[in-house]
């Protein structure tokens, strides 16, 4: 239970204004009414409260809104957003992109990735899906934030908005997120010509299956090493030396540089050494000539 202090009559608060910056923590607790604070939230960000004072104001709002703040309050949080935890944000229902923009601006330059990820998640839930307007807002105000969404949330992305996603927006996406986004991108760009298609699909290829990589290898795409290194290990391993050579084109020489890194290292271990030798790169670690390759995983599955 909170320790109670009576508000001195001369300190009574009838509206939220700059005089509150001179209130001690105890005085704020005793004199600022949470309902009044919520009603006049639009004034709070213009007042230079200390972090300790902001803590008190946050606790006041928590008292008033135990089930989570309404959007009318969230919209005006300003620097008070910096005091919010992911658990606080998880209780919110946010539908307005103006609210999202305002809070993304506040969070810039602060270590708030978990809070921002949760906020974006609440916006997607509130709006029903990650629509084009939301995606545009994210790309404009928070590049890379798209990847903070869970694969489950990303599954609501309509293919039509994939075109608005820029390569840098996907930089921090993990394999599970690209697994969700790649099929949507494939659908979105299906009517494009070979070279144009590859430029568009390239940032999403971390979610591509082996079959699609094989198909790309037939199209003279000259994949750069950075893109190749982001491919799913499981998708790369079944590719033959010839297919990788065609896929990379002139960039195949980069394999030597990445020889010790996954997925290149794992792929080398799966290739016959004499096939690797045809590349003339001096790649080592392939299966020696004359060895028989047994796929034990198949045998285990049968037994």
């Amino acid at each position: 239970d909170v320790e109670r202090t009576t508000c001195p009559p001369e300190k009574e608060v009838h509206e939220i204004d700059e005089s509150l910056i001179f209130y001690k923590k105890r005085e704020l607790e005793a004199c600022v009414d949470a309902a009044l604070l919520a009603a006049q939230m639009d004034r709070v960000d213009a007042i230079p409260f200390t972090y300790e004072q902001l803590d008190v104001l946050k606790h006041k709002l928590d008292e008033l809104y135990p089930q989570g703040y309404p959007e009318s309050v969230i919209r005006h949080l300003g620097h008070l957003f910096l005091k919010m935890s992911p658990e606080d944000i998880r209780k919110w229902n946010v539908t307005s992109l103006e609210t999202l923009k305002a809070l993304l601006k506040v969070s810039k330059g602060h270590e708030m990735s978990a809070q921002v990820a949760t906020l974006i998640d609440r916006v997607v839930v509130g709006r029903g899906q990650l629509d084009k307007d939301t995606a545009d807002t994210l790309t404009a105000f928070c590049p890379g934030c798209l990847c903070s969404l869970s694969p489950e949330r990303l599954s609501s992305v309509p293919p039509s908005i994939i075109g608005a996603v820029r390569p840098q927006d996907l930089d921090t996406c993990g394999p599970r997120q690209l697994d969700v986004l790649y099929p949507k991108a494939r659908l979105a760009f299906q009517n494009m010509s070979g070279s144009e298609y590859f430029v568009k699909i390239r940032p999403f290829l971390g979610g591509a299956p082996t079959e699609d990589l094989k198909a790309l290898s037939q199209q003279n795409v000259s994949m750069d090493l950075a893109t190749f290194m982001k491919l799913r290990r499981e998708a790369v391993l079944p590719l033959s030396v010839a297919e990788v050579q065609k896929l990379l084109g002139p960039h195949v020489e980069g394999l030597k540089v990445e020889e010790q890194h996954s997925p290149v290292r794992d792929w080398i271990l799966k290739q016959r050494q004499d096939d690797l030798d045809t590349l003339g790169l001096g790649l080592q670690g392939g299966i020696p000539n004359g060895y028989l390759i047994l796929d034990l995983s198949v045998r285990e599955a049968l037994s």
Epitope: A39, H59, K60, E63, L64, P66
Partner: antibody
């Protein structure tokens, strides 16, 4: 079902004291702002006071400031209004009401208890 | 304090007619904190509208609220016999919280 039941009203002489109680049930009282509102016979509604759930921050109408004290006992789900130095103009039906912070309105009211200040 | 002035004081109408009640604030208030109540003789008030335009639980859709800043309106599209009562507006944007003086809607 939300219920608010006021008690403690009655006839009191000017300058006297009275304590009103409001027993709450059907909702999480410990999370909820509560208010007192009064209505003089044949007149309109007048907000008297409210109290926050955790910090018990209080606010009063100027007409009762320094004479009335609102309080709550969260363990008993009960709201109180201690009325001292009563005046004839305090004669009214006193309602206990729940303030819905998500709506900014008083969404549930008790049936009221009549306080008559007269000699 | 914020003074809320309701007009007219009394509205004499017949069932089925439209009622328009006005509430004017002496200072601009946030519409999120403007509510309307209905009170019948011998009963406690009942919340009708909150946030200037949102109907409270169980309130029929013939009741609607609108307005912003200093001017707010409660409209009853078609009066039913049970709608004849006193209506109050209330603001909780500033302390003290204040009510209007009320508008009585009576049968003509």
């Amino acid at each position: 079902e939300v219920q608010l039941l006021e008690s403690g009203g009655g006839l009191v002489q000017p300058g006297g004291s009275l304590r009103l109680s409001c027993a709450a049930s059907g909702f999480t009282f410990t999370n909820t702002y509560m208010s007192w509102v009064r209505q003089a016979p044949g007149k309109g509604l007048e907000w008297v006071s409210n109290i926050s759930p955790t910090y018990s921050t209080t606010n009063y109408a100027d007409s009762v400031k320094g004479r009335f004290t609102i309080s709550r006992d969260n363990s008993k789900n009960t709201l109180y209004l201690q009325m001292n130095s009563l005046r004839a103009e305090d004669t009214a039906v006193y309602y206990c009401a729940r303030y819905n912070s998500y709506q900014g309105g008083l969404d549930y009211w008790g049936q009221g208890t009549l306080v008559t200040v007269s000699s | 304090e914020i003074v809320l002035t309701q007009s007219p004081g009394t509205l004499s109408l017949s069932p089925g007619e439209r009622a328009t009640l006005s509430c004017r604030a002496s200072q601009s208030v946030s519409s999120s904190y403007l509510a309307w109540y209905q009170q019948k003789p011998g009963q406690a008030p009942r919340l009708l509208i909150y946030g200037a335009s949102s109907r409270a639980t169980g309130i029929p859709d013939r009741f609607s609220g609108s307005g912003s800043g200093t001017d707010f309106t409660l409209t009853i599209s078609r009066l039913e016999p049970e709608d004849f009562a006193v209506y109050y507006c209330q603001q909780s944007y500033y302390y003290p919280i204040t009510f209007g003086q009320g508008t009585k809607v009576e049968i003509k």
